[in-house]
C-alpha cells in the first residue's frame, strides 16, 4: 500500500477519505487505527456502527469521527480540533472476523495555524452552534507519499 498524506491546520478539522470497492467489502465494518511505530501494531481509534446497515451514522471517539458510505465505497474519518500530537501514520481498515484488511495507509500532517496570534474574542466555540458540521468548514489536502519518502522520521 502506498501512503497518502493528508494535511490539516492545527485547531481546525481534517477530513480523511478512504475509497474501496463496495462489493468486495460488502457487509464488513470498518475501522480507523493509529500505527504505533513503523513495525508496531495498529491501535484502534474508532470503528463503524455495530450494525453494518447503520454504518452511515457518524460514530465518535473523543475528537475522531467515522462514517461509511457502504454503497458508494468511501470511508470518511474526521479529526476535529486537530492538534500536533495527532500527526502520524494511520490506517483505514476493513474488518472480517478477527482479520483486518488495510484499505489505505494515511500520514496525517499538522500545519501550524497561521492565525494563532488572533485575539481570544475571535475564537469560535462549539457551543455557539447547534452542530459542529453546520458551523465549521473542514479542510484537507492530500497527496501520495513520494517514492523514497518515509512516513516516520529516523529514530536516533
Amino acid at each position: 500500500h502506498n501512503t497518502t498524506v493528508f494535511q490539516g491546520v492545527a485547531g481546525q478539522s481534517l477530513q480523511v477519505s478512504c475509497p474501496y470497492d463496495s462489493m468486495k467489502h460488502w457487509g464488513r465494518r470498518k475501522a480507523w487505527c493509529r500505527q504505533l511505530g513503523e513495525k508496531g501494531p495498529c491501535q484502534r481509534v474508532v470503528s463503524t456502527h455495530n450494525l453494518w446497515l447503520l454504518s452511515f451514522l457518524r460514530r465518535w471517539n473523543g475528537s475522531t469521527a467515522i462514517t461509511d458510505d457502504t454503497l458508494g465505497g468511501t470511508l470518511t474519518i474526521t479529526l476535529r480540533n486537530l492538534q500536533p500530537h495527532d500527526a502520524g501514520l494511520y490506517q483505514c481498515q476493513s474488518l472480517h472476523g478477527s482479520e483486518a484488511d488495510t484499505l489505505r495507509k494515511v500520514l496525517v500532517e499538522v500545519l501550524a495555524d497561521p492565525l494563532d496570534h488572533r485575539d481570544a474574542g475571535d475564537l469560535w466555540f462549539p457551543g455557539e452552534s447547534e452542530s459542529f458540521e453546520d458551523a465549521h468548514v473542514e479542510h484537507s489536502i492530500s497527496r501520495s507519499l513520494l517514492e523514497g519518502e518515509i512516513p516516520f522520521p529516523p529514530t536516533s
Partner: antibody, heavy 119, light 107 residues
C-alpha cells in the same frame, strides 16, 4: 416466509416514466439492502442499482444514471424503482431482489414486473 | 466492468446425468461468485454464493467450485426439475455483472 410482491404489468409510451413497487414481508425490511435487476425478453440479467432501506442511500449502474430513481417507504416496507425517459429497449421484466449482508448475492426475488414500452 | 463468460450456452442432458457449467471472469474476482437457476416466466433463484457455499434449502446435488477467474457449477445427478437456465454473477468488483446464461435442456 420472506416474500417480495411487485406491482402489476405496465404499458408505456416512449418518453414516459414508470414506477414499479416491491412490497416486502416475512422479514425486517430495514435489515437488508434492496436491489433492482432487469431482464429484456430472451436476454440475460442486468443490475440497475441498490438502495439502503434505512438511510435511503442509493447507487445506480452507470448505464441508468440520471434516468433511474430508487426510493423506499419504511412505514409500509416497500421499495420503489422509477425509470424515466423510457425507450423501446427498456421493455423488460423488472425484478426487486433482497441482498443479505454476508454476501452481495440476491437471496430473494420479487415475481417480476413486465414493462412494455411501445408507441 | 468485469465480463462474465459462461460455457456452454446450452446443453442437452438426461435425468441422472452429471452436468458441469463453467463461468470465466475477465479478471480475478477471488471467490466472489454466485450461481442462479431460472425457469421460464419465473424469477431467478440463488443456488450458490461465494463460489462454493450452498444457499439454504438448495439440494446438495448442486455444488460450486473455483477461485480467481475460473468457476464451475456441478449438478451431480440431474433431476427433472433442474431443466432451466443457469446464470453466474460476480460480486467482487462494482458493478456486479452476470454471465449470459446456460440453458440446460432435456436430451
Amino acid at each position: 416466509q420472506v416474500q417480495l410482491v411487485q406491482s402489476g404489468a405496465e404499458v408505456k409510451k416512449p418518453g414516459a416514466s414508470v414506477k414499479v413497487s416491491c412490497k416486502a414481508s416475512g422479514y425486517t425490511f430495514t435489515g437488508y439492502h434492496m436491489s433492482w435487476v432487469r431482464q429484456a425478453p430472451g436476454q440475460g440479467l442486468e443490475w440497475m442499482g441498490v438502495i439502503n432501506p434505512v438511510s435511503g442511500n442509493t447507487v445506480y449502474a452507470q448505464k441508468f444514471q440520471g434516468r433511474v430513481t430508487m426510493t423506499r417507504d419504511t412505514s409500509i416496507s416497500t421499495a420503489y424503482m422509477e425509470l424515466s425517459r423510457l425507450r423501446s429497449e427498456d421493455t423488460a421484466v423488472y425484478y426487486c431482489a433482497r441482498i443479505p449482508s454476508y454476501t452481495y448475492a440476491f437471496d430473494y426475488w420479487g415475481q417480476g414486473t413486465l414493462v412494455t414500452v411501445s408507441s | 466492468d468485469i465480463q462474465m463468460t459462461q460455457s456452454p450456452s446450452s446443453l442437452s442432458a438426461s435425468v441422472g446425468d452429471r452436468v458441469t457449467i463453467t463461468c470465466r471472469a475477465s479478471q480475478d474476482i477471488s471467490n466472489y461468485l454466485a450461481w442462479y437457476q431460472q425457469k421460464p416466466g419465473k424469477a431467478p433463484k440463488l443456488l450458490i454464493y461465494r463460489a462454493s457455499s450452498l444457499q439454504s434449502g438448495v439440494p446438495s446435488r448442486f455444488s460450486g467450485s473455483g477461485s480467481g477467474t475460473d468457476f464451475t457449477l456441478t449438478i451431480s445427478s440431474l433431476q427433472p426439475e433442474d431443466f432451466a437456465t443457469y446464470y453466474c454473477q460476480q460480486h467482487g468488483h462494482s458493478p456486479t455483472t452476470f454471465g449470459q446464461g446456460t440453458k440446460v435442456e432435456i436430451k
